[in-house]
Amino acid sequence: FQTFEGDLKWHHHNITYWIQNYSEDLPRAVIDDAFARAFALWSAVTPLTFTRVYSRDADIVIQFGVAEHGDGYPFDGKDGLLAHAFPPGPGIQGDAHFDDDELWSLGKGVVVPTRFGNADGAACHFPFIFEGRSYSACTTDGRSDGLPWCSTTANYDTDDRFGFCPSERLYTQDGNADGKPCQFPFIFQGQSYSACTTDGRSDGYRWCATTANYDRDKLFGFCPTRADSTVMGGNSAGELCVFPFTFLGKEYSTCTSEGRGDGRLWCATTSNFDSDKKWGFCPDQGYSLFLVAAHEFGHALGLDHSSVPEALMYPMYRFTEGPPLHKDDVNGIRHLYGPRPEPEPRPPTTTTPQPTAPPTVCPTGPPTVHPSERPTAGPTGPPSAGPTGPPTAGPSTATTVPLSPVDDACNVNIFDAIAEIGNQLYLFKDGKYWRFSEGRGSRPQGPFLIADKWPALPRKLDSVFEERLSKKLFFFSGRQVWVYTGASVLGPRRLDKLGLGADVAQVTGALRSGRGKMLLFSGRRLWRFDVKAQMVDPRSASEVDRMFPGVPLDTHDVFQYREKAYFCQDRFYWRVSSRSELNQVDQVGYVTYDILQCPED
């Protein structure tokens, strides 16, 4: 082993890390788990502990980036340099960066979680055998409904385990259609579409209508990404394989190496290669994020490269399923930090959490999905895609309170609740509220008295939201909720009436989640809420950090603003934007300075 000159190391043992962003190659839970397991390798043999935090002052900040990504050490495209890490120290020192031009996997091909089927949401196994043939991507073979599926073991013929792959024919994400699948063909701007399209959007996201006519119904969703069949290189990088495709007059239902001398798998990205000549390489085995992270974290802890070829800290990537740490790695890290205090524990047995699956359909090799069993989309706020802009708020007749320093919104440390109402941001605190419209040099207006505008409300609010379609305003305080429609109020009602149990002490926030649906938050938990029925779906209860990794677990307010989700803790917010299947923290800032544009004096 080698350490860098001066034995650079951390001088405290409780190391913190922040996962700043994510790769789209793997489900977030798998990425979180890969990093946690990588840290666990080092904590198992030293006195070090690793705690995940959600702020940039973490010791080790983990980031995915491509090419020039904000430091002086750009990445180099696919392969070559996979990642890099800085030695221990303040600021960027100790951070670990991963090249997102790589295909990140667990070392054995793309990770595609499944839905339905009979495999409890297990990931696809590539390659797999079906009817004696090998498949390296999801397939529609054996089915008449066009739904792509995969085996979750190496051999479907012998094991019969399968699930359905992400497909717009099964579900869509975000949008305003509550996760309904695409309707093909559909009409958009008078034109017929029989596949997902990026037309009408500037951000490159693929979408579809969920009814036969978008122009009339304005219902849409985003098409799920298909990591298993998104091609690299060739002349169609980023596009999807089309199966079956014709090559030299023959039909192919899976990637092939035919016509190549190097054995690399490829596919056509249209149904006919012979006429269209559009193609790309199929995904390879990818690099194990767990193994690469374990190596980089070794650097971030102060280890240089080892000259022992079997060591984790040897400078060449080598996939292994055995224990990654070699005696040389252990000696190196213990040279810096000493051994783990006795008694020596058994090696931790960490397993990758499997995504939870919806109810399974009894299979008779692989069956069609009944419409009633189609899943709903993940409840995330829409990307910049709402087909209609938010309505503007009506003029307010509220009276302004005489001003004192504490009445300046910029002097408020922590607001009780924040909500976007109409196209303005409302900020509530101790019986008062301010209104804010984004714009150059604009300042919050107010304070106004809550009692003047909404006389039934208490002084202290926990959260507020406006349901855009009905213009209903929901105000939560403690175990009670008030619903205002214009000047008329319903309530107070107890949270039980919304289907929230006695263990829910307060509602701390809400986000839109499709047409007439919201997510309600309380501490670390969230539920889907039907605004019309004014009931939560009790089966929808979920952990906040599963759906929104990277946000603090003790947020006191969650609100939506300009189509992004904001999670507030203390004076700070964590902003989350939804991109394809990922909810990604893209900014951490101060409510006052960064949202309200208060001067930093």
Epitope: E68, D71, G72, Y73, F75, D76, G80, L81, G91, Q93
Partner: antibody, heavy 123, light 107 residues
Framework: EVQLLESGGGLVQPGGSLRLSCAAS???????QMWWVRQAPGKGLEWVS????????FYADSVKGRFTISRDNSKNTLYLQMNSLRAEDTAVYYC?????????????????WGQGTLVTVSS | DIQMTQSPATLSLSPGERATLSCRAS??????LAWYQQKPGQAPRLLIY???YRATGIPARFSGSGSGTDFTLTISSLEPEDYAVYYC?????????FGQGTRLEIK
């Protein structure tokens, strides 16, 4: 002892080509990022191009599309192929070894430099 | 690109005096700064890396300090062989850039 020895400089007409070489010895050449830095007569230092041990290449905007950096790890040699040369490319060209290598970064500085080779572009 | 500004452009001092050379970055570069010495007809020589670490074989009279945007190279007591041009170079962001140089001459 670490040594870097450049060669291949000379007088060339505008639009012409030259290939510079840098022979390295005394360290594990294949491990390190390598650089070409130039210095026009009487002027300061300017980064031209660099190459990772993995082969990833980077270029200053002023030479992009005209210069190509490469390395032959079996021969411990760094190259700079210069095409479409212009008068403003006239300079002493130095090859330099980085202190940082591979994926362990955060070490800034070029700890060894060659003696330089003069490239003159003139008609 | 990050601009590196060195000052003064020329510094005239006598042997035995203390020399203080300044380098300012147009934005924060953490501690990713190196100092080089170049004598006429020679290649640059690394003096200081990562803002404050002396390179191998560099005398103790050379020291570097600073972090963020402001950096200083100090020569505690000038020797005759120290008269040269000094360059700073950053790698806090891509691409790397050099300062325009400070000429240290005998007074």
């Amino acid at each position: 002892e670490v040594q870097l020895l450049e060669s291949g400089g000379g007088l060339v007409q505008p639009g012409g080509s030259l290939r510079l070489s840098c022979a390295a010895s005394g360290f594990t050449f294949s491990t390190y990022q390598m650089w070409w830095v130039r210095q026009a007569p009487g002027k300061g230092l300017e980064w031209v191009s660099s190459i990772y041990s993995s082969g990833g290449t980077f270029y200053a905007d002023s030479v992009k599309g005209r210069f190509t950096i490469s390395r032959d790890n079996s021969k411990n040699t760094l190259y700079l192929q210069m095409n479409s040369l212009r008068a403003e490319d006239t300079a002493v060209y130095y090859c330099a070894k980085d202190r940082a290598y591979g994926d362990y970064v955060g070490w800034n500085g070029f700890d060894y430099w060659g003696q330089g080779t003069l490239v003159t572009v003139s008609s | 690109d990050i601009q590196m500004t060195q000052s003064p452009a020329t510094l005239s001092l006598s042997p035995g005096e203390r020399a203080t050379l300044s380098c300012r970055a147009s934005q924060s570069i953490s501690s990713f700064l190196a100092w080089y010495q170049q004598k006429p007809g020679q290649a640059p020589r690394l003096l200081i890396y990562d803002a404050s670490y002396r390179a191998t074989g560099i005398p103790a009279r050379f020291s570097g300090s600073g972090s963020g945007t402001d950096f200083t190279l100090t020569i505690s007591s000038l020797e005759p062989e120290d008269y040269a041009v000094y360059y700073c170079q950053q790698r806090g962001n891509w691409p790397i850039t050099f300062g325009q140089g400070t000429r240290l001459e005998i007074k």
